[in-house]
């Protein structure tokens, strides 16, 4: 059977700019090395948002300037997005990778609409 | 426009070493995956190797795996297959092709190739 | 590892004809598929990838389609240009397998 990747369709932005969504794959193999990358599809063009290797059991760990944190329980992870804006909303993608060991495996999710509403600016308090 | 150069195929003898490489130019190789792929005379394409964009991964057929090793010298733009322990069955012609690797929503696929360069294992 | 098989092994046709080449994987692969074109002693061109992505600069009449285990790639006017051997390969698991080959030639 194929790796399947699974993600929920729709998830609001909170006020904040913060955005959650689970991240689940069945695994075709016994893989210790899980590479996750988040894409975003907008107008037809895919840019990568960030991306984590992990090994089972152990954190996610993505770059220091990342908008991304995120944790792993077995084949489910769960991710977090910050810092966005109403022109982020947007399709994002959860790729996985089975890095290792061999063979090598890849799955990609349908995509998650993640809406983000920039909040209405506090009136002036005169 | 994008090249790939393949060179160091030649006649060997079983159980020799073997070095190929591919100069890469017109893309910013450092950006690609790349693989080898080789056809022996009168047959198919064999997948042999694999090596990430950034040289954290390799994957090998199991044909090849234990004998063949796949590099990349990003300051080079160049690609090695250095093959050891070498067999008659491992005649052909090796290709190198090219593999867009960031924010990809497909699988791996070959865009370019190389005009590849021919071994034969022969005593 | 994944297996991967063509139909026909090869085929006589006509310039104009309606041409269809089946590919199969002994497991699901979902849409990890691509299409390349061969012909003799030069290197394999990318046709199709992911299964129905037609590669720029590659004519419309070449198209394919499938998803799990069964592919078509279909050339809806043979050319004279299109006789050659076209290639399957899966892109789901290493090791990345081709197809044998399905050689098409003039009847």
């Known amino acids: 059977k194929a790796m399947h990747v699974a993600q929920p369709a729709v998830v609001l932005a909170n006020s904040r700019g913060t955005a959650s969504f689970v991240c689940e794959y069945a695994s075709p193999g016994k893989a210790t090395e899980v590479r996750v990358t988040v894409l975003r599809q907008a107008d037809s063009q895919v840019t990568e948002v960030c991306a984590a290797t992990y090994m089972m059991g152990n954190e996610l760990t993505f770059l220091d300037d990342s908008i991304c944190t995120g944790t792993s329980s077995g084949n489910q992870v769960n991710l977090t997005i910050q810092g966005l804006r109403a022109m982020d909303t947007g399709l994002y993608i959860c790729k996985v990778e089975l890095m290792y060991p061999p063979p090598y495996y890849m799955g990609i999710g349908n995509g998650t609409q993640i809406y983000v509403i920039d909040p209405e600016p506090c009136p002036d308090s005169d | 426009q994008v090249q790939l150069v393949e060179s160091g195929g030649g006649v060997v003898q079983p159980g020799r070493s073997l070095r190929l490489s591919c100069a890469a130019s017109?893309?910013?190789?450092?950006?690609?995956?790349m693989h080898w792929v080789r056809q022996a005379p009168g047959k198919g394409l064999e997948w042999v190797a694999v090596?990430?964009?950034?040289?954290?991964?390799?994957y090998y057929a199991d044909s090849v795996k234990g004998r063949f090793t796949i590099s990349r010298d990003d300051s080079k733009n160049t690609l090695y297959l250095q093959m050891s322990s070498l067999r008659a069955e491992d005649t052909a012609v090796y290709y190198c092709?090219?593999?867009?690797?960031?924010?990809?929503?497909?699988?791996?696929?070959?865009?370019?190739w190389g005009q590849g360069t021919l071994v034969t294992v022969s005593s | 590892d994944i297996q991967m098989t063509q139909s026909p092994s090869s085929l006589s046709a006509s310039v104009g004809d309606r041409v269809t080449i089946t590919c199969r994987a002994s497991?699901?692969?979902?849409?990890?598929l691509n299409w390349y074109q061969q012909k003799p002693g030069k290197a394999p061109k990318l046709l199709i990838y992911?299964?129905?992505s037609l590669q720029s600069g590659v004519p419309s009449r070449f198209s394919g389609s499938g998803s799990g285990t069964d592919f078509t790639l279909t050339i809806s006017s043979l050319q004279p240009e299109d006789f050659a051997t076209y290639y399957c390969?899966?892109?789901?698991?290493?090791?990345?397998?081709f197809g044998p080959g399905t050689k098409v030639d003039i009847k």
């Open positions: 090596i990430w964009y950034d040289g954290s991964y390799k």
């Open positions: 390969q899966q892109s789901y698991s290493t090791p990345f397998t």
């Open positions: 992911a299964a129905s």
């Open positions: 497991q699901s692969i979902s849409s990890y």
């Open positions: 017109g893309f910013t190789f450092s950006s690609y995956g």
């Open positions: 092709a090219r593999a867009p690797h960031y924010a990809i929503l497909t699988g791996y696929y070959e865009d370019y």
